[in-house]
């Protein structure tokens, strides 16, 4: 039967009606409306926007729209005592100071409440000392410094360029290396694409532009003071000394004009190789300290930011399902921005708004989805995914029993080249089938499908004729749903050409220059890429909420499990002697993957054949599909990361943005050759193989015939 018959509605209310109702002009209008003033988490302006969205979603026709508030730890600069960095001479006089704010973009000079660049949750402090340049401050950069170059960062202020990995990992690495302060800067090599002008004449980062961002290492905890539980009115809060994930050393971000002044004087060791050189006209010497003439000069940080428990507001909209109201498909994206949020998040929020409007239009005409759809406008994402995590903590029992899928909706664009999708393998076939039905917006692909342009521009490295779909990592609001609760999740946006543009993210990310004009002038003047992303996100939600049989293919999980098992085995086999000595075997894991593959295949056969008119059997099969993702959750979590509970995927321990497969085994094997107790280390590898093998086998059994 078609989904139309299932929900007893007229045939015109199908996916096509939903997609046809989505309009680029509306997305453009919504984006403009959401970006005229800053909407920093915890501010009155963001509360007012929450109420506006609540009101508009009600007008659009949702059954209910509520605000869900929490009191969480946020961080702000001191308005009267600005943060900055100085070069000081031997007398302690400040001979150079970094900028106090970014030059405002044209037309925004009189806007109040633009938060100056800062590293959210930096402790206060005024450390002074010699500078060490640590490249991207990745794990491997500190290995190079400490092990190969014998450079000690203890008691030094380190300067690291943004890019490659999440900034919180950079700070954690610097702390572990003994640094007493961290300066983060945007190098033109990473944030200035050749042949493009700086904003406002193009989409590149000007020298005075600075990337804001939090520097937490929460590992999925949510509010640092209430890990595991919602930050509600009767919450018990930890003391600040016991808070989760806070950095212990001062951190501050700067632009490349200021970085030039710090780096041009660097002395000490030369850069180890060309991968440590950026694009500034400086030597990229590692240090420590300044060169000859300037050797008596030091760097001093002045950080006065404060951490404050502040109220935040999520907007939660409900469109009740007609047949299975107790099954939830969630579309969520954040609303809070660092400044204007032209791309992050409002290009996503505008798309969500238009999706809600389209669903509302269908509902007003008598249609309802089969399953309940929840729409969320999350707060305080920029401060550590706080709004989504607190709401999920508050509603975890409902979500783990009723959550079918979560589709994330942050920035709709980070470029205008092709589609980018990260999702659970369960959604691969859904994404493939949907994109085959959508028109490509790309030049040169007129009349062709989105699937075709996407596959041509971003081919799968493994399967010819298919597009690349990546693993979910973190750094966005799907984290709690996927990594903690085991709800099938996905995200989609338009991206840049990674082949030709090797800069990290997009140049104006988290700067004051992320404006409506940036999008309207340079990225998507016709809003055709935004519309395509709306069709992909909205189409996924429509199918997940409306198809009679859930559009999940468990066979795709079997394929990737084999791939991930092969990969982790090959990593382990770099140590053949130790594997022999400590009797390390992957047989149990490969056996579990084989069993999973066979059981998934049989389940898929039954899925084709069963009587879909029998509501009990239909519900039973759908529940097996819904709970498959849940079956990969280990209630004990990963070592030292209790809120990362998915055994197949976790954010990389070295880069929160990246996903790692079989993360428990991967982390146990990482740098194992340097462990002081090899027997203990290889014992942990064996334990992690056991956990992974058991989990895969247990997940497979959830797909077996029930009796």
């Amino acid at each position: 039967k078609s989904s139309n018959e299932a929900t007893n509605i007229t045939p015109k209310h199908n996916m096509k009606a939903f997609l046809d109702e989505l309009k680029a002009e509306n997305i453009k209008k919504f984006l403009y409306n959401f970006t005229q003033i800053p909407h920093l988490a915890g501010t009155e302006q963001n509360f007012q926007l929450a109420k506006q969205i609540q009101s508009q979603w009600k007008e659009f026709g949702l059954d209910s729209v509520e605000l869900a508030h929490y009191d969480v730890l946020l961080s702000y600069p001191n308005k009267t005592h600005p943060n900055y960095i100085s070069i000081i001479n031997e007398d302690g006089n400040e001979i150079f100071n970094t900028s106090l704010f970014e030059p405002p973009p044209p037309g925004y000079e009189n806007v109040s409440d633009i938060v100056p660049p800062f590293s959210a949750f930096s402790p206060q402090g005024m450390p002074e000392g010699d500078l060490v340049y640590v490249n991207y401050a990745r794990t491997e950069d500190f290995f190079k410094l400490e092990r190969d170059m014998k450079i000690n960062c203890s008691g030094k202020i380190v300067i690291a360029r943004y890019g490659k990995v999440f900034r919180g990992n950079k700070v954690k690495n610097a702390q572990l290396a003994g640094a007493k302060g961290v300066i983060l800067y945007s190098d033109p090599a990473d944030y200035f694409a050749p042949g493009v002008k700086s904003y406002p004449d193009g989409w590149n980062l000007p020298g005075g532009g600075v990337q804001r961002g939090n520097i937490l290492n929460l590992n999925g905890a949510g509010d640092p003071l209430t890990p595991g539980y919602p930050a509600n009115e009767y919450a018990y809060r930890r003391g600040i000394a016991e808070a989760v994930g806070l950095p212990s050393i001062p951190v501050h971000p700067i632009g490349y004009y200021d970085a030039q002044k710090l780096l041009e004087k660097m002395g000490g060791s030369a850069p180890p190789d060309s991968s440590w050189r950026g694009s500034l006209k400086v030597p990229y010497n590692v240090g420590p300290g300044f060169t000859g003439n300037f050797s008596t000069q030091k760097v001093k940080m002045h950080i006065h930011s404060t951490n404050e428990v502040t109220r935040i507001y999520n907007v939660i909209g409900t469109l009740r399902g007609a047949v299975e109201p107790d099954r939830y498909v969630i579309l969520g994206g954040h609303r809070d921005s660092w400044v204007f949020g032209g791309i992050d998040p409002q290009s996503g929020a505008a798309v969500v708004h238009e999706i809600v409007r389209s669903f509302g239009t269908l509902k007003k005409e008598g249609w309802r989805p089969r399953r309940t759809i929840l729409f969320a406008s999350w707060d305080a994402e920029e401060f550590g995914l706080l709004g989504s995590t607190e709401w999920a903590e508050e509603n975890s029992r409902l979500l783990q029993e009723r959550g079918v899928a979560y589709i994330n909706a942050d920035s709709s664009i980070e470029g205008n080249y092709t589609l980018r999708v990260d999702c659970t393998p369960l959604m691969y076939s859904l994404v493939h089938n949907l994109t085959k039905e959508l028109k490509s917006p790309d030049e040169g692909f007129e009349g062709k499908s989105l699937y075709e342009s996407w596959t041509k521009k971003s081919p799968s490295p493994e399967f010819s004729g298919m597009p690349r779909i990546s693993k979910l990592g973190s750094g966005n609001d799907f984290e709690v749903f996927f990594q903690r609760l085991g709800i099938a999740s996905g995200r989609a946006r338009y991206t840049k050409n990674w082949e030709t543009n090797k800069f990290s993210g997009y140049p104006l990310y988290h700067s004051v220059y992320e404006t409506y004009e940036l999008v309207e002038k340079f990225y998507d003047p016709m809003f055709k890429y935004h519309l395509t992303v709306a069709q992909v996100r909205g189409g996924m939600v429509f199918e997940l909420a409306n198809s009679i049989v859930l559009p999940f293919d468990c066979r795709d999980y079997a394929v990737v499990l084999r791939k991930y098992a092969d990969k982790i085995y090959s990593i382990s086999m770099k140590h053949p002697q130790e594997m022999k000595t400590y009797s390390v075997s992957f047989d149990s894991l490969f056996s579990a993957v084989k069993n999973f593959t066979e059981i998934a295949s049989k389940f898929s056969e039954r899925l084709q054949d069963f009587d879909k008119s029998n509501p009990i059997v239909l519900r039973m099969m759908n529940d097996q599909l819904m709970f498959l993702e849940r079956a990969f959750i280990d209630p004990l979590g990963l070592p030292d990361r209790p809120f990362y509970r998915h055994v197949i995927y976790a954010p990389s321990s070295h880069n929160k943005y990246a996903g790692e497969s079989f993360p428990g085994i991967y982390d146990a094997l990482f740098d194992i050759e340097s462990k002081v107790d090899p027997s203990k280390a290889w014992g942990e590898v064996k334990r992690q193989i056991y956990v992974a093998a058991f989990t895969v086998q247990a997940a497979a059994e959830t797909l077996s015939e029930v009796a």
């Epitope: 970094t98 704010f101 030059p103 405002p104 000007p206 020298g207 005075g208 532009g209 632009g255």
Partner: nanobody, 123 residues
Framework: QVQLVESGGGVVQPGRSLRLSCAAS????????MHWVRQAPGKGLEWVAF????????YYADSVKGRFTISRDNSKNTLYLQMNSLRAEDTAVYYC????????????????WGQGTMVTVSS
């Protein structure tokens, strides 16, 4: 259109003080570093002082260091030069000029000039 208008010049005795103003129009002062430059009678141009757009850094010619202070009020789109302990050799036409680099951190080239205001230091 983009312009700079200096005011506040005049005749003053040695050792006294004077404050020059420079009103900017047609562009936002808040985005630009600004300079004061002077030209003594029959002499070439001499750079006097520079302040970054955000007020975080000030640079001075050795000849005025400790006596002159450059400042700005971005909300009024106005640049100032407070001149204390004036000397006869400070006699000149004083020009304000806009630095050409938006958000620049050190003095660079000028791209817009005012018409100047005359300061005469004489007993």
């Amino acid at each position: 259109q983009v312009q700079l208008v200096e005011s506040g010049g005049g005749v003053v005795q040695p050792g006294r003080s004077l404050r020059l103003s420079c009103a900017a129009s047609g562009f936002p002062l808040i985005s630009y570093g600004m300079h004061w430059v002077r030209q003594a009678p029959g002499k070439g141009l001499e750079w006097v002082a520079f302040q970054t757009y955000d007020g975080s850094n000030r640079y001075y010619a050795d000849s005025v260091k400790g006596r002159f202070t450059i400042s700005r009020d971005n909300s009024k789109n106005t640049l100032y030069l407070q001149m204390n302990s004036l000397r006869a050799e400070d006699t000149a036409v004083y020009y304000c000029a806009r630095d050409r680099i938006v958000g620049g951190r050190v003095p660079d080239a000028f791209d817009i000039w005012g018409q100047g205001t005359m300061v005469t230091v004489s007993s």
